[in-house]
Amino acid sequence: TQNKALPENVKYGIVLDAGSSHTSLYIYKWPAEKENDTGVVHQVEECRVKGPGISKFVQKVNEIGIYLTDCMERAREVIPRSQHQETPVYLGATAGMRLLRMESEELADRVLDVVERSLSNYPFDFQGARIITGQEEGAYGWITINYLLGKFSQKTRWFSIVPYETNNQETFGALDLGGASTQVTFVPQNQTIESPDNALQFRLYGKDYNVYTHSFLCYGKDQALWQKLAKDIQVASNEILRDPCFHPGYKKVVNVSDLYKTPCTKRFEMTLPFQQFEIQGIGNYQQCHQSILELFNTSYCPYSQCAFNGIFLPPLQGDFGAFSAFYFVMKFLNLTSEKVSQEKVTEMMKKFCAQPWEEIKTSYAGVKEKYLSEYCFSGTYILSLLLQGYHFTADSWEHIHFIGKIQGSDAGWTLGYMLNLTNMIPAEQPLSTPLSHSTYV
């Protein structure tokens, strides 16, 4: 007689990453009987919600329900019906909503309220929508990549099961770049973390970790661009801004009201004698780099050493995974290879930015012009942030690994968030037989 396969005893979880520029839904799956083991949770689906980030719905909250429909229906299809009621759904909003909350707590609450109402109509176990802190975003990103890289497993292996693995239990640092903020998180080497706000203590799988983290609000790639434009237009002699961060021949009209809409440009705000200005690209990497550096205040540091803007940063230690927009931008520019030195990256950026806009449009005909036009800025910004902001050097550059996925799961904060909220990261190392557990991150 043929053996009938038993129904697989699996569990699912859903996390929505409500970022500043868009929302993505991730579906995770794991064997129910192994949920305390490290590395068993994996991503089975990613669904990118069509449209902008949720903070952009502040004047049209009635459209939020429709906005979320396609991806929530996709989740309904992917997850077996019998599992719907047991599947937790979490939504975490990041820097786009932090910025909206800074402008108006009432408006941010209204958006979150409607998001919660909309998501609660699905047959899942909805666990709420909230704005996560920058510290959480950094910490959960760090947990995600180290969980996926097998760094929390106490079993040492003589072979590598995942890329980037260095066959030791040294954790990777995490570098996350979003549209509105950027996070740096790592375990410093025997260094006291001088500012308590940047210190995290974890006990994971029986081991203690003292982790440094900081989230730089307004230093995501989109908000950094707005900052740069607001800074540069201050000294423009008329309504034409000759911008080295855009390709030669590129032209775009910007509304001053849009420029000053974000809290990130408040420090540069001034009364201008025009309502609009035109960006005219001149495509010069070096000048673009110099302009970006003016966004980083390195003249003041109340600690032994700082990143920028007076924020403590310990000496860099070990390998780093750079993900989210760090990866997407560098992948587009074909600069993610481990073999490409920092000098080579800089050279390639110089060439790329100098290419005429018409040529770029022809070479990348399938890419939306809005995104295509900003790769010169974004690539230059990544180099400036990593080298001058975080003090990576030409030598330590080789310790940065641009990571999109690890073992099929996206690098980012969402997996770490779900692992924590579902109590799947025990403080102590689980024994071979599953035990009840109560202490978690």
């Epitope: 009635n62 329900g65 941010a108 609450d109 979150l112 409607v114 919660e116 109402r117 909309s118 666990q127």
Partner: antibody
Framework: QVQLVQSGAEVKKPGSSVKVSCKAS????????ISWVRQAPGQGLEWMGS????????NYAQKFQGRVTITADESTSTAYMELSSLRSEDTAVYYC??????????????WGQGTMVTVSS | EIVMTQSPATLSVSPGERATLSCRAS??????LAWYQQKPGQAPRLLIY???TRATGIPARFSGSGSGTEFTLTISSLQSEDFAVYYC?????????FGGGTKVEIK
């Protein structure tokens, strides 16, 4: 101070529908949510669903999904709760109640007087 | 959904005595908890919100405490008008859920 005034008692046949109204007097709904809560004879309180009249956004308890429809008419400051495919277990007092705030502030600070709905053949 | 459990189901107390009612949530609701009083033939009335803040017009003898999963409503000195059914309700997450109620009756 806003008051919520509900429509009168109803007797309905199994399989039919009922529509209960809830009018805000002495004020408007504003941007407050309106929840509907029912109470079967001798039983506790059971939340059915909610609407933000300003936006027409409704959400429902899973138990009632597909059977209840909550709507609102801002111009008359009236909310409605329609329950279809009625059965005897739906015999209850149905209350509308105003939610006092928005995000995670859904305490119910003003209640209607209740509408008795009896389902009997 | 979050399950709210109230105890005891019935509490017999003499007028002037103290009454302590308990409410437990199946997961943490922070301080997003309300208490209601309901008398026969009447709609419920909001007494306490935010776990411990008295609603407008509620006498000082009513007090709420707790956070997370364990909550208490205390009536310091029961008056004749306080004999009623009391419900707790969480409003952290949808669906809004109520406890089964505690009936406070005259001993």
């Amino acid at each position: 101070q806003v008051q919520l005034v509900q429509s009168g008692a109803e007797v309905k046949k199994p399989g039919s529908s009922v529509k209960v109204s809830c009018k805000a007097s002495g004020g408007t709904f504003g941007s407050y949510g309106i929840s509907w809560v029912r109470q079967a004879p001798g039983q506790g309180l059971e939340w059915m669903g909610s609407i933000i009249p300003e936006f027409g956004i409704a959400n429902y308890a899973q138990k009632f999904q597909g059977r209840v429809t909550i709507t609102a008419d801002e111009s008359t400051s009236t909310a409605y709760m329609e329950l279809s495919s009625l059965r005897s277990e739906d015999t209850a007092v149905y209350y509308c109640a105003r939610e006092s705030g928005t995000y995670r502030d859904h305490r119910l600070d003003v209640w209607g007087q209740g509408t008795m709905v009896t389902v009997s053949s | 959904e979050i399950v709210m459990t109230q105890s005891p189901a019935t509490l017999s107390v003499s007028p002037g005595e103290r009454a302590t009612l308990s409410c437990r949530a199946s997961q943490s609701v922070g301080s997003n908890l309300a208490w209601y009083q309901q008398k026969p033939g009447q709609a419920p009335r909001l007494l306490i919100y935010g776990a411990s803040t008295r609603a407008t017009g509620i006498p000082a003898r009513f007090s709420g405490s707790g956070s997370g999963t364990e909550f208490t409503l205390t009536i310091s000195s029961l008056q004749s008008e306080d004999f009623a059914v009391y419900y707790c309700q969480q409003y952290l997450l949808w669906p809004l859920t109520f406890g089964g109620g505690t009936k406070v009756e005259i001993k």
